[in-house]
């Protein structure tokens, strides 16, 4: 008798979330910084929520959070939450340091 092959698809809530920062976690003021919420999820994440160090939700819901021009006041810890049809997951905190530059201060 011929055997049938079955594929079992496992659905799971977002996991292993992390915030990556480009060009890095230390950015000179006036430049741009992009925070990306990376995750493993099935089905893929359908909705992202971003939070700052006060656990205040930010008005951004895409996978990438772009800050341009970045300001020293943007410095702090950020985390993201990913949601799919199965559930939610959250990342650890990642710290962004936006630093003063003598050049930009001199142009003020």
């Amino acid at each position: 008798t011929a055997s049938k092959a079955w594929t079992l698809e496992v659905l799971y809530a977002p996991r292993r979330l992390r915030v990556s920062m480009s060009p890095g976690d230390q950015v000179m003021e006036g430049k741009s910084a992009t925070l990306t919420c990376e995750s493993d999820a099935n089905p893929p994440v359908s909705h992202y929520t971003w939070f700052d160090w006060n656990n205040q939700s930010l008005p951004y819901h895409s996978q990438k959070l772009r800050l341009e021009p970045v300001k020293v006041q943007h410095s702090g810890a950020y985390w993201c939450q990913g949601t799919n049809s199965v559930g939610k997951g959250r990342s650890p905190l990642s710290t962004l340091t936006v630093y003063y530059s003598p050049e930009t201060i001199g142009r003020r």
């Epitope: 410095s75 702090g76 710290t95 340091t97 630093y99």
Partner: nanobody, 121 residues
Framework: QVQLVESGGGLVQAGGSLRLSCAAS????????MYWYRQAPGKQRELVAT???????NYADSVKGRFTISRDNAKSIAYLQMDSLKPEDTAVYYC???????????????WGQGTQVTVSS
């Protein structure tokens, strides 16, 4: 309490050199952006040089090509090598450190004595 202690200042003739040190007491020194500032009598504090954890550096136009900022993460020290010194470099020099939104010294704080650099002509 985290401390920053500057040293290495002194009296030097124009054209001479000095190396300033900023010794920091935080265990995670390598994660901090480090700054050197200076304040001349009757003037506002001025940012001179910046170095990131990854040794990216930036300088004020007035010191470019003459001053070099560096760091030794193993010793938790930031340096300012000052060459071709000019009388207008005379000031008290201070360091500062930043991680995220935390500055070890805030602008309203008493920044202490710093280290005095005097350049005579």
């Amino acid at each position: 309490q985290v401390q920053l202690v500057e040293s290495g200042g002194g009296l030097v003739q124009a054209g001479g050199s000095l190396r300033l040190s900023c010794a920091a007491s935080m265990s995670s020194f390598s994660q901090y952006v480090m700054y050197w500032y200076r304040q001349a009598p009757g003037k506002q504090r001025e940012l001179v040089a910046t170095i990131t954890s990854y040794s990216n550096t930036n300088y004020a136009d007035s010191v470019k090509g003459r001053f070099t900022i560096s760091r030794d993460n193993a010793k938790s020290i930031a340096y300012l090598q000052m060459d071709s010194l000019k009388p207008e470099d005379t000031a008290v020099y201070y360091c500062n450190a930043q991680y995220g939104s935390t500055f070890i010294r805030n602008h309203w704080d008493d920044w202490g004595q710093g280290t005095q650099v005097t350049v005579s002509s």
